[in-house]
Structures are given as C-alpha cells and as structure tokens.
C-alpha cells in the first residue's frame, strides 16, 4: 500500500574539523521510494557538486573535505507524492584549530606615540589571544592592552617597550604562534651637553663640545655664522646611543657656532640645536694677518642688492665694522637718489659689493674684490656722465668728506676675471638677461680707459658692455 514518507532518524548537529569528512543521515520510510533533496541555508545542493557525496538513495549526505565556509543549517526533504513532503534539519558546526589570519609586523614607532601590533585570528571555538615579549608572557598594565581583535595596543610607547613580540592564539583544539616581530622605539634627537661660549685671545685654539642622544643615534653638524664650518677639526665618538662631537677651532674672528643634532624617522627628521659664541678679547688690536672677519650681512641698506644670507667681510680697521660700513653705504646711497634710472641700480650694486665685499673660503678671512669688468661697466656704460661729474668734483675738492671716496672703487686696481675668474666677484644685477632683452642698456661708452682683454664667449649668457670687453 502507498505510504507517505516518514523521517525515522531526524538530522542532528554535526561537529567537524576543517578538512575532515562530515556526514548527515536522513533515514526515510515510505512507499513508493521517495525523492530526497538537500539544502544548505535554504539553497539547494546540486547532485553533481563534487564537494558532496549523496548515497543510499539520497539518505546520506557527505561533505568530503569540510571548509570553514561550510558552517550552516542542512535540511533533507523527502517526497513520494503520497501525502505531503517531510523535512528534517540539523546544523554543521565547523570546528577549527586557531589560525592567525593577520599576523603582527615589525613596527618602528617614535617614543610617546601609540603602537598597535595586529594579531587577527580564526578558530572555533573562538581562540583566546595572548602575547609574549622576549621569552616571557606579556603582562597587561595601564599602558598595554590586548584588544578584542587580539591586537596589542601600547599607549605612550617607552624605550623599554622595544623588543621582540609574538602573539599566541589558543582554543580547545590547539595553539598557533605568530612569527617573532620587532618593535623598535625611535627617540627624537636631544642635546645632552650644549657647547659653552668662550672669550679668547686672537689666534688661540678653542674646543667646542656637544653631546646628543636619540634613536637612531643622531649625527652632529656644526654651523659657523649660519654656514657649514669651513675650518677646524671635528672628532666624534659614539657610545651607548650617545654621540660626542668636539670641534677644535683656530680663532681668528668672532663667531656664533651652532651644534645641530639630527636623526631620521622614516622620511622625517628630528633636530635639536644648541649655540655658543666665540668672542675675541682685545679684538681692537691690529693683526698683520687679519684685517677683518667674515659674517652674515645684517644691515638694511644693501638687503635688496646682496644675496640672501650673504657672507661679507667686515673690516676691523673700524672700531665697529658693521656700523661703520653700513654708514658708508647709507651716506653714498642717499647721493644716488639723484642719478639716472639707468645708473642707479648699477651704482647701488657696485657700492654694496664694494663696501661689503663677498667673503671667500680657502684662506680665511679674505674679501673678494669686484671684477674690473663690472666696475668698468658701471663707470663707462651705466654711469658714464655721473662718474665723470663725481671725478670732477673730487679734483676740485668739492666733497666735504673723504668718506664717499671709500665707497667708490678704482677700477684699474681691481682684478680681471679674464686672468682669474675666481679672483673677483661678479655683479649679477648687471648681467644681460637673454630672456629679457629690455634689460640691455644703450651703448654710451667709448673704449675703456683701462685695457681690458677681449673675453671669449662662454656657455653662460654674456652681456657685451663695450666693443672691447664683455661680462660672462
């Protein structure tokens, strides 16, 4: 007789480990024989899906190699056309040994910041996560905590937090260890011992001492009056993350010496600075070998003319060289207000570069005179009329003060850049600019009174100032 299907062994919850076999049994009594279908999470399992095996007329469903994604509710439905279809359901719980899905990585962190070492895990039952530092379990404290995700968070990182870390994931089925990672704590450069200021006699030796620390160990550079130290010897030693630098100087001029400690954190740098002054006792005493010293121009009159941070020569034949030289240019500058627009910028450039001569390294301290070619360009091209008038006034004794004469160079007594291009300073303001031909002045000059060689044209732009000489 026909008999409606009855499921005699309802499905039960099945526990299975990943990669193991899991089987659901759905025993059915009926006549005629029923059709049995299987679903997972209400989605039909296809008969030809090779991950499954369906046997015993559909009463046995076997998952051949369990994956963690196989978790879910499995149902069997039996139908033979007699009465209604019957269904039984059971859960598959995929059990999984702990697995670290996002292991920690090496971290470099600056002291005082927050560090997070990731450790994301999988597993069923859910693994508990702990951390090992070095060889010992890490104890949580007010700065250290293991987050819900398993990651380790360290607030206000300190030098002592540096070391080797690994995370451990544990459940009833086993334990997983991450690879060992390194937490490196970097520390901003800091000066431990600043150089001391000195007041010394001319020609004596002075040692400036600067000590700094940081992680990585900083490098120390010395700056003299805003420029890299050009003379003196530097000795350095490093011990226990402390760098010790000694700058030995032969003192021929006063100066401001700055010790700069720098270290690198990724793409960024941290810097610490400390400065000391070296002044010279009895500085006013004339020294045969030292007619002045080099320092950055701090005046106002020549600011627009001299290069930014220009290193200029200060003549110690004056009691206060900076003030005296500034007064010199100031006085002459006022007289230039009446000259032609063509002459004025050229004369201002000549004036400032003559009174505040550029300083040369090499044999220190030495001023570099203006190149004869540039002086002649001002005298015979830009300011021919004005120069002539000034010379006439001088011959007739119309100038009350000798002061302005100091600010006007005698072109014939200046070196030519033709014979030694490093012997003299050029006046960039006077150079002809090919991009802007309007800057080329009209030719008002005859042959110069001083023979100047014909200069060969060079690769740089050249400005022909007269038929007999050019400025390159």
């Amino acid at each position: 007789l026909p008999k409606a299907p009855v499921i005699t062994t309802p499905l039960e919850t099945v526990d299975a480990l990943v990669e193991e076999v899991a089987t659901f049994m759905c025993a059915v009594e009926s006549y005629p024989q029923p059709e049995i279908s299987w679903t997972r999470n209400k989605i039909l399992i296809k008969l030809f899906d090779t991950r499954y095996s369906i046997r015993e007329n559909g009463q046995l469903l076997t998952i051949l190699s369990v994956e963690d994604s196989d978790d879910g509710i499995y149902c069997c439905t039996a139908n033979n056309g007699v009465g209604g279809a019957v269904e039984s359901c059971g859960a598959l719980q995929v059990k999984m040994k702990p697995k670290i899905t996002r292991p920690p990585i090496n971290v470099k962190i600056i002291e005082g910041l927050k560090a997070v070492l990731p450790c994301t895990t999988m597993g069923n039952p859910k693994p508990s996560v702990s951390w090992i530092k070095g060889d010992s379990p890490l104890r949580e404290n007010s700065r250290t905590a293991v987050l819900e995700s398993g990651s380790l968070r360290i607030h206000n990182v300190q030098k002592e937090d540096a070391g080797q870390y690994r995370c451990v994931a544990k459940n009833s089925l086993g334990t997983a260890y991450s690879k060992v990672v390194k937490l490196e704590v970097e520390v901003f450069a800091r000066i431990l011992r600043a150089p001391e200021s000195h007041n010394v006699t001319f020609g004596s030796f002075v040692t400036l001492h600067c000590t700094a620390t940081g992680i990585p160990v900083p490098t120390i550079t010395w700056i003299e009056n805003g420029n890299a130290v050009s003379s003196g010897s530097i000795q350095e030693s490093v011990k226990d993350r402390v760098i010790d630098s000694r700058l030995q100087l032969f003192i021929t001029k006063p100066g401001l010496y700055t010790c700069i400690a720098t270290n690198k954190h990724g793409e960024k740098f941290s810097t610490a600075k400390a400065a000391a002054t070296v002044s010279i006792a009895e500085w006013s005493k004339p020294q045969k070998d030292n007619k002045g010293y080099c320092a950055q121009y701090r005046g106002e009159v020549c600011n627009a003319v001299l290069a930014k941070d220009a290193l200029v020569f200060l003549n110690t034949s004056y009691a206060d060289p900076e003030e005296a030289q500034e007064l010199l240019v100031h006085t002459a500058w006022n007289e230039l207000k009446v000259v032609s627009p063509l002459c004025r910028p050229a004369a201002e450039a000549l004036l400032c570069n003559h009174v505040f001569q550029e300083c040369s390294p090499g044999v220190v301290p030495t001023p570099i005179p203006i190149c004869r070619e540039y002086c002649l360009a001002v005298k015979e091209l830009f300011c021919a009329k004005e120069w002539l008038a000034m010379e006439e006034k001088t011959h007739r004794g119309l100038y009350r003060s000798e002061m302005h004469l100091l600010s006007v160079p005698e072109c014939s007594k200046l070196p030519s850049m033709h014979w030694d291009p490093t012997a003299c300073a050029r006046l960039p303001h006077l150079d002809y600019n090919k991009e802007n031909p309007k800057t080329f002045p009209p030719m008002t000059s005859s042959k110069p009174s001083v023979d100047i060689p014909n200069l060969p044209s060079s690769s740089s732009s050249s400005f022909s100032v007269s038929p007999t000489y050019s400025m390159t």
Partner: antibody, heavy 115, light 113 residues
Framework: EVQLVESGGGLVQPGGSLSLSCVAS????????MNWVRQAPGKGLEWLSV???????YYADSVKGRFTISRDNVKNTLYLQLNNLKPEDTALYYC?????????WGQGTQVTVSS | EIVLTQSPNSVTASVGEKVTINCKSS????????????LNWYQQRPGQSPRLLIY???TQQSGIPDRFSGSGSATDFTLTINSVQPEDAAVYYC?????????FGQGTKVELK
C-alpha cells in the same frame, strides 16, 4: 697673454737650500693670488703654498717651516725659498696664478735632492 | 685637511664614447652663503703643465671645448667628457679651493683605444 716663467731649480744635496723665482707678465701681478704646486716624478699634483695680495702666506703641512713664499710686486716676481731639503722634495715645481682655482700655470722648474 | 678621492684610477675609452670621472670629498666644499662649490678640474697631458677645465664645480673655463662639463655639489662631484677625442688622453685631477691647505685628488688616467 699671461706668462709665468720659473727658474732657480737644480740639483741640491739633502739639507741644502734653493731659491725658486717666477717672473710674471701679461697681467697686473699685484692684484692676484699666486701659488706654488709641485709634482714628483710619475706622481700626482701637490699644492704647496699661496700668497695673497697683501703678502699673507699659507702653506701645506708637508712644507710648513721649511719653505717660504714671498712676492715682489714691483719686479712682478714670485719666490719660493726651499730650506732643509729632503729627497722626497724632488719634483717639478710650478708657479700658478689663482685664488680658489689654479687658473694659469708656468712650465715648471725641476728640483732634484740627492746625495 | 680635506681629502679628495677620485674614481676610477684609470679608464680606457673609444673615440666618441662618454667618459665619467668621480671625485668625493671628505668634507663639504660648498659655501652656504653663495651655494658655490669650490671644486675644480684639471687636465694634464703627457709632458705638459696642467690646465684648468672647470671651476666652481660646473663653470667651464674659457677656451675649453663644450664636451667637458662638471656637476655635483657639497661632497660628490663628476667630470664628464662627452664624445671623447684622441687629444683628451691625459690625467685628470680634481682639486678643492675651499679650505687651505688646498688639496688634489690622486688623478684619473684616461687612455684611448
């Protein structure tokens, strides 16, 4: 045209002295720094000394205290006085015009120190 | 004193090839205030006096062919001979004019095949 002509070289015994001269022409000598550079046989160049326009001199450590540079701006002449000579001072000695670059060189004068 | 180290010590090239000579300084030879590098290059042909090719690291001395060029700043400098010619067979020296005592590199010999 700049010309620098050295003279005064020769053979001298160790411990002896020599005076080298360099006559300059074609430029205003007094306005320029002047140098002495030497080259030992088959060796590289060695800078010895420079004298500035105020006759202030600077020397290489290897010759300090033994060699003296000087100039006579009236005679347009540069000098190098060599004292207490050693065999390792054997070289071709060049007179050179230049401040921070050595721009124009003479042909050199040979100094040989040998017993 | 400032030590200058040239590389290579010697180089052999064919006519038309590019030759590069390096010069490394033990200290900066660049002045912060004017950004000039006080580094010069010289050529010394066999049996001749040296001649200045390049000053301030990259400025060509007058009368020097355009195939000679200099580059670099602070401590690392290069002399380049583009399309080397038979007359370029010589020893090349770098020299610093930044700090007395002025010093030279040991020299680089350029030979032609």
């Amino acid at each position: 045209e700049v010309q620098l002509v050295e003279s005064g070289g020769g053979l001298v015994q160790p411990g002896g002295s020599l005076s080298l001269s360099c006559v300059a022409s074609g430029f205003t000598f007094s306005l320029y720094y002047m140098n002495w550079v030497r080259q030992a046989p088959g060796k590289g160049l060695e800078w010895l000394s420079v004298i500035d326009t105020h006759s202030i001199a600077y020397y290489a450590d290897s010759v300090k205290g033994r060699f003296t540079i000087s100039r006579d701006n009236v005679k347009n002449t540069l000098y190098l006085q060599l004292n207490n000579l050693k065999p390792e001072d054997t070289a071709l000695y060049y007179c050179v015009l230049g401040r921070t670059a050595l721009v124009r060189w003479g042909q050199g004068t040979q100094v040989t120190v040998s017993s | 004193e400032i030590v200058l180290t040239q590389s290579p010590n010697s180089v052999t090239a064919s006519v038309g090839e590019k030759v590069t000579i390096n010069c490394k300084s033990s200290q900066r030879v660049q002045l912060g205030s004017n950004q000039k590098s006080y580094l010069n290059w010289y050529q010394q042909r066999p049996g001749q006096s040296p001649r200045l090719l390049i000053y301030y690291a990259s400025t060509q001395q007058s009368g020097i062919p355009d195939r000679f060029s200099g580059s670099g700043s602070a401590t690392d400098f290069t002399l380049t001979i583009n399309s080397v010619q038979p007359e370029d067979a010589a020893v090349y020296y770098c020299q610093q004019g930044y700090s007395a005592p002025f010093t030279f590199g040991q020299g680089t010999k350029v030979e032609l095949k």
